[in-house]
């Protein structure tokens, strides 16, 4: 199960954060209807990624991957999708 | 649906104190060099942002988990 | 009243360089996004590239990546495209256009558009 | 890259007449999906954006439509000044990318 699959929205806009692109920000906070005001936080958010570099961007995304693809995660996706069977069985 | 150590890991980055976000991140990734980092964006976070705009973030994130495409 | 007027356009040989600017005017430059649009004689329309309303962060198309840069000076509202290692395919008018609002990029205002020939 | 493609390239009406015109997405959208007017030797303007909200001073006439992948402008009758060609453009996602056009000529 790959973790983009689990909330996709969710790994656009920490991508753009982190990448510090202000173009990706605003279209993945479009897709969730964001208001002026939060956009504004999550600016400042993506402002210290950038004021801190490459090399920061790529520890942050590293351990969100880390996290993302660790078994406290990988066993919720194992344990949704068993939970998932298990409902289409029945509805059968 | 978003994982729950993913949640926690962004509600500590917004809403824990520094000292918490980096045991929570040395959970996972425990190199200096990582930590250091953690240290440093949480560090900035909290110097940028005032109360109001960590609410504005967690509604963000609220509209995000609860949005059709999560 | 929102203007876009566009400059710099020119016969240039491949492998040249040429310098785009659009000056801004009747609106707050600095709020909004901007993009460049071209479109080569008889042909449709075709996205080069967007820059932010901080001008921080921008995104080309990979028909011009590497070669063609965005940029803009928010002090003299003016949007700008330096134009390198021009090849005979980027003959087309330019327009630029600005971004709606933030929260949904679409083009409401364009220029006229400027004319770049690549021509040996 | 997400393509656009657009039916028909080419359509021929008379004054009066209620036309569509038909863009697809090579994949889901949602709505994130403009139209714009262009006549020869003129700048494009923007008619709809958000797959059907009418822009400011744009007449009633226009009307867009679609969700996902297959998106729809009608114009409900047709006026001497409608001739033109029509680019739809998707704002999904970088690169943001047009249709190739549908040209509106007279009968």
């Known amino acids: 199960v790959k973790m983009a699959e689990t909330c996709p929205i969710f790994y656009d806009v920490f991508f753009a954060v982190a990448n510090g692109n202000e173009l990706l920000l605003d279209l993945s906070l479009t897709k969730v209807n964001a208001t002026e005001p939060e956009r504004t936080a999550m600016k400042k958010i993506q402002d210290c990624y950038v004021e801190n570099g490459l090399i920061s961007r790529v520890l942050d995304g590293l351990v969100m991957t880390t996290i993302s693809s660790s078994k406290d995660c990988m066993g919720e996706a194992v344990q949704n999708t068993v939970e998932d069977l298990k409902l289409n069985t029945l509805g059968r | 649906e978003i994982c729950p150590a993913v949640k926690r890991d962004v509600d500590l980055f917004l809403t824990g104190t520094p000292d918490e976000y980096v045991e929570q991140v040395a959970q996972y990734k425990a190199l200096p060099v990582v930590l250091e980092n953690a240290r440093i964006l949480k560090n900035c976070v909290d110097a940028k942002m005032t109360e109001e705009d960590k609410e504005n973030a967690l509604s963000v994130l609220d509209k995000i988990y609860t949005s059709p495409l999560c | 009243e929102v203007q876009l007027v566009e400059s710099g356009g020119g016969l240039a040989q491949p492998g040249g360089s040429l310098r785009l600017s659009c000056a801004a005017s009747g609106f707050t430059f600095n709020n909004y996004a901007m993009t460049w649009v071209r479109q080569a004689p008889g042909k449709g329309l075709d996205w080069v590239s967007a820059i932010s309303d901080s001008g921080r962060s921008t995104f080309s198309a990979d028909s011009v990546k590497g070669r063609f840069t965005i940029s803009r000076d928010n002090s003299k509202n003016t949007l700008y495209l330096q134009m390198d290692s021009l090849r005979a395919e980027d003959t087309a008018l330019y327009y630029c256009?600005?971004?709606?609002?933030?929260?949904?990029?679409?083009?409401?205002?364009w220029g006229q558009g400027t004319l770049v020939t690549v021509s040996s | 890259d997400i393509q656009l493609t657009q039916s028909p390239s080419f359509l021929s009406a008379s004054v009066g007449d209620r036309v569509t015109i038909t863009c697809w997405a090579s994949q889901g959208i949602s709505s994130y999906l403009a139209w714009y007017q262009q006549k020869p030797g003129k700048a494009p303007k923007l008619l709809i954006y958000s797959a059907s909200t009418l822009q400011s001073g744009v007449p009633s006439r226009f009307s867009g439509s679609g969700s996902g992948t297959e998106f729809t402008l009608t114009i409900s009758s047709l006026q001497p000044e409608d001739f033109a060609t029509y680019y739809c453009q998707q704002l999904n996602s970088y690169p943001f990318t047009f249709g190739p056009g549908t040209k509106v000529d007279i009968k």
């Open positions: 256009a600005k971004h709606r609002n933030w929260n949904y990029p679409v083009f409401d205002y």
